[in-house]
């Protein structure tokens, strides 16, 4: 047995005769032997479920699910309530009713085995019939929904009339039915006024009822119609059994180049027309289980459930529905020498399911893992400027394949053949297992015999020892000129573009910082800024070479305070500015300012944004927001 | 009200090793770079060292590279030098500065009454 | 290093004058410059920074001017208290130099 709401609502009146009809409550039946026998919890509650006092006022036919007044509550019955409820002024009441022999104790209400009673309270009497209007005549202030489980028998779920008035006004004629297209599960009997269902419900072919209820009053000579929404929702069973899409059970995949723990190296998906089991209880209740087999399988696989709710049409309705996504992922790195063919089983029970048949599908994996073979070009020809600075970034070197890599570790070193011109470094990039190349030794680069550069390029996987290696030549181009004196470590302090470009900075490859040119468009990615090399800072990623220097570029890599219109970076750096960011690394502070300080008030609210009250902040930056830029630009 | 507090000078023979310590109240510490700037009596001011908010990054002017070490404890709201193989042109009042900043650098908006450093045999 | 020269490097005037002091930079610091001021016995005390901007609570009469290498610090009365050593500093690249004071007496 189950309520057909989790929620009842009435009005009380002071001094309301005792005798009077409240409301029905009504329960649908899981199972067709099933008789209802309705009981009501001992106690009123009040405002955040205060317990006011045992309930010596409505009581319940069991049989029926009718409330009404034993005896009439009067005002000094309503005070001594009042009196109770934490000092809130009482406007609601609540009582709990049960559906026995369900819940035998009065705890928590919880739907289905229990709903709960809600009494708006009048500190008035009854208002005269005449002054009431045909909306109260008919349907009480809080909208009804209802909820009917599908598959079950069909029953009475609610009774349309307002019982009070019915009582108190019986010379107020009302009537009511219902606005249903044809064909539909619902019938309003023309004498008791309830509405019942015509037949069992399934909610896979609809799920929402969205209907009308019509009110018809009749008072005297005049006719007045009141229509309000009727809203029916089926609740879900597990009836029906998972199946596969399009009938594809079997998934093919090669593992070469992605070989990192926590790939997904193949999907397969199941349908299933329910949505139960509900979230929280999916993935205990829809289990997957990779059948076993050797050892090495296990080890290397698993298999993630990511369920997903979707929606499918039936009936010229949407309803919803679920579908399984069953990942098979490597669960750890795989080495480069791993070379075999396997097919891997998953069972899928969804362990709710009833039946008929069975709720159980076997899903196939055929996963072939491939070897990876290290590869360099032959050899690799590269310039650099005499006046480089430290960790210009001048190359890159890749195993054939390298940007496809991932969960494969690949070292890159250099070996100079003249001690005294081992001028570049190399480090591994984490993103895309390339090597890129810069300058470590600036001396080196100004003698004069070091101008041809000769390298051994050797790429390594530690875990198999195996190895490539290629040539490796770097002519060395220009003329040395002494940088400025005094110029600043970092290009990134450089606000504007003639002291951006007449200075060098750490990570400059031509010894001379570039300046790039912002959009102007408010806070932009696009920002101004003065940079070692444009081509590499800032681009919103601080890169491995990048991470030897905060000065070579703070516009990516700071992980201090930006002070002005900006968005941070994800994790660190300055994602997009307003105008021109400038930075100075050793204080971990950039700021972002307009490039033309023509707006007074956009100078007041970007060059000079500091901090509000720094104790009110606890020195957060107080970030412009790009509209109010705008609106400053406009104005 | 923002103070700033130097204690730990006085009188160190050369070769010797001192450490001055600047105690801070009125602004949120962590937020602030910091600096040392001394001055030799009857001379003008000279920048010694500087550190960030987080303490993760230090400088020192070439005069005093290797000898010395900057350091601050966010927690007690304390910056410190500390000063190793003392000479004799070491000897001046040392002041601590908060460091405030425009885009235009940084710039000294509060310092200490300073403490005096002597370096004499 | 970038080295700052400050002129003159002493300075005799009266109550109500009107004294411009002179900072030049080694080379260019485009409006990287502060000003301070220093009583005797006491710590520096920040009048202007970024060249031109007026720290709060420094009076009016201070004005500071300048771009590039040549830099000017004016005070349009002088008041008693001004009567003080006045230094500039340069904030654009480390280390980041004084220059060597400006010493201004009552005449």
């Known amino acids: 047995l189950y309520f057909s709401r989790d929620a009842y609502w009435e009005k009380l009146y002071v001094d309301q005769p005792a005798g009077t009809p409240l409301l029905y409550v009504h329960a649908l039946r899981d199972a067709p032997e099933e008789v209802p026998s309705f009981r009501l919890g001992q106690h009123l509650y009040g405002t955040y479920r205060t317990r006011l006092h045992e309930n010596n006022w409505i009581c319940i036919q069991e049989d029926t699910g009718l409330l009404y007044l034993n005896r009439s509550l009067d005002r000094s019955s309503w005070e001594k309530l009042s009196g109770r409820n934490r000092g809130f002024p009482l406007l609601t009441v609540y009582l709990k009713v049960f559906l026995s022999p369900t819940s035998l104790r009065e705890g928590e209400c919880q739907w289905p085995g229990c709903a709960r009673v809600y009494f708006s309270f009048f500190n008035t009497s009854f208002p005269a019939c005449t002054s009431l209007k045909p909306r109260e005549l008919c349907f009480p202030e809080t909208r009804p929904s209802f909820r009917i489980r599908e598959n079950r028998p069909p029953g009475t779920f609610h009774q349309f009339r307002l019982l009070p008035v019915q009582f108190l006004c019986p010379n107020i004629s009302v009537a009511y039915r219902l606005l249903e297209g044809e064909g539909l599960p619902f019938r309003c009997a023309p004498d008791s006024l309830e509405v019942s269902t015509r037949w069992a419900l399934d909610r896979e072919q609809r799920e929402k009822y969205e209907l009308v209820a019509v009110c018809t009053v009749h008072a005297g000579a005049r006719e007045e119609v009141v229509m309000v929404p009727f809203p029916v929702t089926v609740y879900d069973e597990d009836d029906s059994a998972p199946t596969f899409p399009a009938g594809v059970d079997t998934a093919s995949a090669v593992v070469e180049f992605k070989r990192k723990e926590d790939t997904v190296v193949a999907t397969l998906r199941v349908f299933d027309a329910d949505v139960v089991p509900a979230s929280g209880e999916l993935v205990r209740r829809y289990t997957s289980t990779l059948l076993p087999g050797d050892t090495w399988t296990q080890q290397t696989f698993r298999v993630e459930h990511w369920p997903n709710e979707t929606s499918v049409q039936a009936n010229g309705s949407f309803v919803r529905a679920t579908v399984h996504d069953y990942r098979l992922v490597l669960n750890r790195n795989l080495s480069i020498s791993e070379n075999r063919t396997m097919q891997l089983a998953v069972l899928v029970n969804d362990s709710d399911f009833q039946g008929p048949g069975a709720g159980v599908l076997l899903l196939h994996f055929n996963v072939s893992v491939l070897p990876v073979s290290l590869h360099l070009p032959s050899s690799y020809s590269l310039s650099v400027s005499r006046r480089a600075r430290r960790f210009a970034q001048i190359g890159k070197v890749c195993v054939e394949n390298c940007q496809a890599f991932s969960g494969i570790n690949v070292q890159y070193e250099l070996h100079s053949s003249g001690a005294n011109c081992s001028t570049l470094g190399v480090v591994t990039s984490a993103e895309d297992t390339s090597g890129i190349l810069f300058v470590n030794d600036t001396k080196a680069l100004r003698r004069p015999k070091c101008a041809e550069l000769h390298y051994m390029v050797v790429a390594t996987n530690h875990q198999t020892s195996r190895q490539a290696q290629a040539q490796l030549l770097v002519t060395v181009e220009g003329l040395y000129v002494a940088e400025e004196a005094g110029c600043p470590l970092s290009c990134a302090v450089s606000k504007r573009r003639p002291e951006c470009e007449e200075c060098g900075g750490l990570g400059s490859p031509t010894g001379r910082c570039e300046w790039r040119q912002g959009d102007g468009k408010g806070i932009t990615r696009n920002f101004s800024t003065c940079s070692p090399s444009t081509k590499t800072c800032p681009d919103g990623h601080c890169d491995v070479v990048e991470t030897q220097d905060i000065n070579i570029c703070p516009q990516d890599c700071l992980r201090g305070s930006i002070v002005g219109g900006h968005e941070p970076g994800e994790p660190r750096g300055i994602k997009a500015g307003y105008g021109t960011c400038n930075c100075f690394p050793e204080e971990e502070k950039c700021f972002c300012e307009p490039e033309d300080i023509q707006d007074p008030l956009c100078d007041e609210l970007c060059r000079e944004q500091k901090l509000i009250s720094e104790e009110d902040l606890g020195g957060e930056q107080k970030l412009i927001s790009e509209e109010d830029l705008h609106h400053h630009h406009h104005h | 009200e923002v103070q700033l507090v130097e204690s730990g000078g006085g009188l160190v023979q050369p070769g010797g090793s001192l450490r001055l310590s600047c105690s801070v109240s009125g602004f949120i510490f962590k937020n602030y770079a910091m600096r040392w700037v001394r001055q030799a009596p009857g001379k003008g001011l000279e920048w010694v060292s500087g550190i960030s908010g987080s303490g993760g990054i230090t400088y020192y002017a070439d005069s005093v590279r290797g000898r010395v070490t900057i350091s601050r404890d966010n927690s007690k709201n304390t910056l410190d030098l500390q000063m190793t193989n003392l000479r004799a042109e070491d000897t001046a009042v040392y002041y601590c500065?908060?460091?405030?900043?425009?885009?235009?650098?940084?710039?000294?908006?509060?310092w200490g009454q300073g403490t005096l450093v002597t370096v004499s045999s | 290093d970038i080295q700052m020269t400050q002129s003159p490097s002493s300075l005799s005037a009266s109550v109500g004058d009107r004294v411009t002091i002179t900072c030049r930079a080694s080379?260019?610091?485009?409006?990287?410059l502060n000003w301070y001021l220093q009583r005797p016995g006491k710590a520096p005390k920040l009048l202007v920074y970024a060249a031109s901007s007026l720290q709060s609570g420094v009076p009016s009469r201070f004005s500071g001017r300048g771009s590039g290498t040549d830099f000017t610090l004016t005070i349009s009365s002088l008041q008693p208290e001004d009567f003080a050593t006045y230094y500039c500093q340069q904030s654009y690249s480390a280390p980041y130099s004084f220059g060597q004071g400006t010493k201004l007496e009552i005449k």
């Open positions: 080379q260019s610091i485009h409006n990287y």
């Open positions: 500065a908060k460091a405030e900043y425009s885009s235009s650098g940084a710039y000294f908006d509060y």
